[in-house]
Interface confidence: low
């Protein structure tokens, strides 16, 4: 079978348009377009338009779709662990008698040993082993700032537990910030959530290797169980390649609409409800940029292929190591519409209607 | 071309295995497997195993991959807005002189009007218009609980702004809970984040339609700008279908491994590094369940097809309205590995290696 057959672009567009006809009706669970007999004349009511706009704002403001992974995310991440500075260190002295918080300090030079440059860091987690506890408590994590202030990072509601359990906090931003500074001691504060009214702001949660009164309860605290940072980073030697010529492109509208890419890419397609589907029943919008994915994803591996030539192509053409990679949507966005059911205008949101980028999968 | 040709399953598996060979080397940026000449004899060092296990724990504990969308998410959502109970209502009396918080109450019967049954609610957002402000403040949102207590919902760091701006909080869980209870007035509390040490716990952020001293600064507060709930829900009549016989299945290992599904599904494939790839250089794990996607996604729309027959199939076979839908991975998981570079053991995490579920895209 030749893979070089010409693509009839018009046929593909026609098929996509007809598929969209079915998709919209199916999402609305309509067997056919609704009758427009009772639709009142004149423009849409102001309240309906306001509601439609609110829905559009949401789409613009906080699309929950995952971003396409950056090139570096495709490659393997080296995993290392950096233990908290030992509790005997003088830096802990000032924090001794504070009942609402416990502190964990880390040496930036240890972190830099594992992650020589900030952009190489892919993920950093703070791992704490919480001892068994019979109380529920809302806790917060803060990052130490230079001028002795603390920046809020996140919170967790901890329910009672009969056994020790590991907690994990994503502290990638904080660690990347430390790496952007010189070396030194940096830290986290793990606190009770102090409410505006409550008088009891004591931290009841105990952390292995920190909580002072439990210091000896497991004999010498085993290093493996004291707080540590779990770091995932692109090794320095691997990072050099990321700045070489062969980049993994985002196959999105920015790139695809302005290039003559023959391989997998997002292709422009505007659907005009009246012209393309012969529909007058959707009152807003008049149409939308549906787009579609098209183009080959060459299968680029066989036993007789020379390894080194092929490896650089993997990231773009077959990152998921599929037996027959396929050009499919990656980032999708919803579409709000306004239509009438009888005399009643409805605002509805249709999920995954607009193709923003494609990928070989 | 006949789409009924028999699939040579062994050939597909072979292609997937060879693709994985390239994928792993490419992710590690290796042109060929590393030499094992200097690898020290004996088991892996304990610290390396502990690190490998930490990485595996992370994968088990908090995979960041999005869940496959439930069937209901495919269908259109009706959008409605429910305004906050008017500030003149007696319920606000008790909350007048509290400086750290402002309160917003909603009538559950108004919400139920829009969402007659809790499971129909897809998303609820609390929208507040914040007035211009020159201060930065960390704020929190709480949900009213029956016994006059408050449950923490979320927080936001608000930076200074020269113009009014809309804030949006996801309150789906809270609203669903209210719908599960009887009718009545329910509310949210919007508070300053009260720190354990700080004495100034005053809320400096002002919300249009609430903050008392600004009550008249825009003339009569325009209804459109007072706090409201933006609700997205499956209409009742559409929901009946979700309980009918034809479900959209999750094409995951639970379903696919135990069925004889001919169409798109995840297929079982265990890769043994030694047997399948002839590799001895990966020390942990010995192999992994890579799996793969296979099976047709029939294109199910044409002008002469009878609408109603086809609509029910859309959700399963071509939810993205593709011109040529394709069976591709949906949920993927990473794989941590241990291997040696010279005498040095390395723990690395490879992204998107294990196929957990598939979809037609």
């Amino acid at each position: 079978l030749s893979t070089c057959k010409t693509i009839d672009m018009e046929l593909v567009k026609r098929k996509r348009i007809e598929a969209i006809r079915g998709q919209i009706l199916s999402k609305l669970r309509l067997a056919s377009p609704p009758s427009q007999g009772e639709v009142p004349p004149g423009p849409l009511p102001e309240a309906v338009l306001a509601l439609y706009n609110s829905t559009r704002d949401r789409v613009a403001g906080e699309s929950a779709d995952p971003e396409p992974e950056p090139e570096a995310d495709y490659y393997a991440k080296e995993v290392t662990r950096v233990l908290m500075v030992d509790r005997n260190n003088a830096i802990y002295e000032k924090t001794k008698d504070i009942s609402h918080s416990i502190y964990m300090f880390f040496n930036t030079s240890d972190i830099r040993e594992a992650v020589p440059e900030p952009p190489l860091l892919s993920r950093a987690e703070l791992r704490l082993q919480r001892l068994k506890s019979s109380v529920e408590q809302h806790v917060e994590l803060y990052q130490k700032y230079s001028n002795n202030s603390w920046r809020y990072l996140g919170n967790r509601l901890l329910t009672p537990t009969d056994t020790p359990e590991w907690l994990s906090f994503d502290v990638t931003g904080a660690v990347r910030q430390w790496l952007n500074q010189g070396d030194g001691i940096q830290g986290f504060r793990f606190s009770a959530h102090c409410s505006c009214d409550s008088k009891d702001n004591k931290l009841h949660v105990e952390i292995n290797g920190i909580s002072p009164k439990r210091r000896g309860d497991l004999g010498t605290i085993h290093d493996m169980n004291r707080p540590f940072l779990l770091l995932m980073a692109t090794p320095l030697e691997r990072a050099q390649h990321l700045h070489s010529s062969r980049h993994r492109r985002a196959l999105d509208t920015n790139y695809c609409f302005s290039s003559t890419e023959k391989n997998c890419c997002v292709r422009q397609l505007y659907i005009d409800f009246r012209k393309d589907l012969g529909w007058k029943w959707i009152h807003e919008p008049k149409g939308y940029h549906a787009n579609f994915c098209l183009g080959p994803c060459p299968y680029i591996w066989s036993l007789d292929t020379q390894y080194s030539k092929v490896l650089a192509l993997y990231n773009q053409h077959n990152p998921g190591a599929s037996a027959s990679p396929c050009c499919v949507p990656q980032a999708l966005e919803p579409l709000p519409i306004v239509y009438y059911v009888g005399r009643k205008p409805k605002v509805e949101q249709l999920s995954n209607m607009i193709v923003r980028s494609c990928k070989c999968s | 071309l006949s789409t009924c040709k028999t699939i040579d399953m062994e050939l597909v598996k072979r292609k997937r295995i060879e693709a994985i060979r390239g994928q792993i080397l490419s992710k590690l940026r290796l042109a060929s497997p590393p030499s094992q000449g200097e690898v020290p004899p004996g088991p892996l060092p304990e610290a390396v195993l502990a690190l490998y296990n930490s990485t595996r724990d992370r994968v088990a504990g908090e995979s960041a991959d999005p869940e496959p969308e439930p069937e209901a998410d495919y269908y259109a959502k009706e959008v409605t807005r429910v305004l906050m109970v008017d500030r003149n209502n007696a319920i606000y009396e008790k909350t007048k002189d509290i400086s750290h918080s402002i309160y917003m109450f909603f009538n559950t019967s108004d919400i139920r009007e829009a969402v007659p049954e809790p499971p129909l609610l897809s998303r609820a957002e609390l929208r507040l218009q914040r007035l211009k402000s020159s201060v930065e403040q960390h704020v929190e949102l709480y949900q009213k609980y029956s016994n006059n207590s408050w449950r923490y919902l979320g927080n936001r760091l608000l930076t200074p702004t020269d113009t009014p701006e809309w804030l949006s909080f996801d309150v789906t869980g809270a609203v669903r809970q209210w719908l599960n209870q009887g009718d009545g007035i329910q509310g949210f509390r919007f508070s300053a984040h009260c720190s354990c040490d700080s004495k100034d716990n005053k809320l400096h952020v002002e919300i249009n339609g609430i903050s008392p001293k600004r009550r008249g600064d825009l003339g009569t507060i325009h209804d459109m700008n007072r706090p409201f709930l933006l609700l997205m829900a499956t209409p009742l009549e559409r929901a009946q279908h979700l309980h009918s016989s034809r479900h959209r299945r999750a094409l995951d290992t639970n379903y696919c491994f135990s069925s004889t599904e001919k169409n798109c599904c995840v297929r079982q494939l265990y890769i043994d590094f030694r047997k399948d790839l002839g590799w001895k250089w990966i020390h942990e794990p010995k192999g992994y369940h890579a799996n793969f996607c296979l099976g047709p996604c029939p294109y199910i729309w044409s002008l002469d097809t009878q609408y109603s027959k086809v609509l029910a199939l859309y959700n399963q076979h071509n939810p993205g309205a593709s011109a040529s839908p394709c069976c591709v991975p949906q949920a993927l998981e990473p794989l941590p590995i241990v291997y040696y570079v010279g005498r040095k053991p390395k723990v690395e995490q490879l992204s998107n290696m294990i196929v957990r579920s598939c979809k037609c895209s």
Epitope: I91, S109, R112, E113, P116, E117, P118, P119, L120, S146, N147, N148, N180, Q181, G182, D183, G184, I185, Q186, L236, A239, Q240, H243 | -
Partner: antibody, heavy 120, light 112 residues
């Protein structure tokens, strides 16, 4: 023996450009962050810029931000400082210096310096 | 004005002990960042004497020592010699500045 040798200095008019180079030898250049530090006549030391080992991260003093660009060629073991829009206050001896470890901002080896004079 | 403060000049006789100080803040010295001391002999490039506040660089005589307490760092020279006459600079990373690194104004040490 570690050696850093600067070149490319000279006399230039205000608004003009110069490109300084620093040739490194005696150590694995691609493993270390490197910095430019300058010293105006009769004045103290002033940090100018830093580039990390792989050339991924670059940092500049406020006084030169937007005008100076630091780069490196690890294949040629050479560091560069492209200086545009020069001002009279940029007149100084420019030193390149290497980090003691990775990006520690401790300079264990310095070049002999190259003189840059900005004058009309 | 330099963020790290040093006395502009000091003097001492041969054999004496002198201490040069460098005062900073919690965003540099007090923040635990690497602090270094450099010696610049007349007409030459600077040379690293002390790194990480109290470690002697290779080849530096043990007459030179460094210490740090809070926001204050000190360089002590015991048994002062004529060849120690030079400018001495402290340097440290500063997290509050976008510039990143700062040097003290320098101390001119004269051996009488």
């Amino acid at each position: 023996e570690v050696q850093l040798v600067e070149s490319g200095g000279g006399l230039v008019q205000p608004g003009g450009s110069l490109r300084l180079s620093c040739a490194a030898s005696g150590f694995t250049f691609s493993n270390y962050g490197v910095h430019w530090v300058r010293q105006a006549p009769g004045k103290g030391l002033e940090w100018v810029s830093h580039i990390s080992a792989a050339g991924i991260s670059r940092y500049y003093a406020d006084a030169v931000k937007g005008r100076f660009t630091m780069s490196r060629d690890n294949g040629k073991n050479t560091l560069y400082l492209q200086m545009n829009g020069l001002k009279s206050e940029d007149t100084a001896v420019y030193y390149c210096a290497k980090d003691r470890i990775r990006s520690s901002y401790e300079y264990d080896s310095w070049g002999q310096g190259t003189q840059v004079t900005v004058s009309s | 004005l330099p963020v790290l403060t040093q006395l502009s000049s000091m003097s001492g006789s041969p054999g004496q002990t002198v201490t040069i100080t460098c005062t900073g803040s919690s965003s540099n010295i007090g923040g635990g960042y690497y602090l270094s001391w450099y010696q610049q002999l007349p007409g030459t490039a600077p040379k690293l004497l002390i790194y990480n506040a109290n470690n002697r660089a290779s080849g530096v005589p043990n007459r030179f020592s460094g210490s740090k307490s809070g926001n204050l760092a000190s360089l002590t020279i015991t048994g002062l010699q004529a060849e120690d006459e030079a400018d001495y600079y402290c340097g440290c990373y500063d997290s509050s500045l976008s510039t990143g690194y700062v040097f003290g104004g320098g101390t001119k040490l004269t051996v009488l």
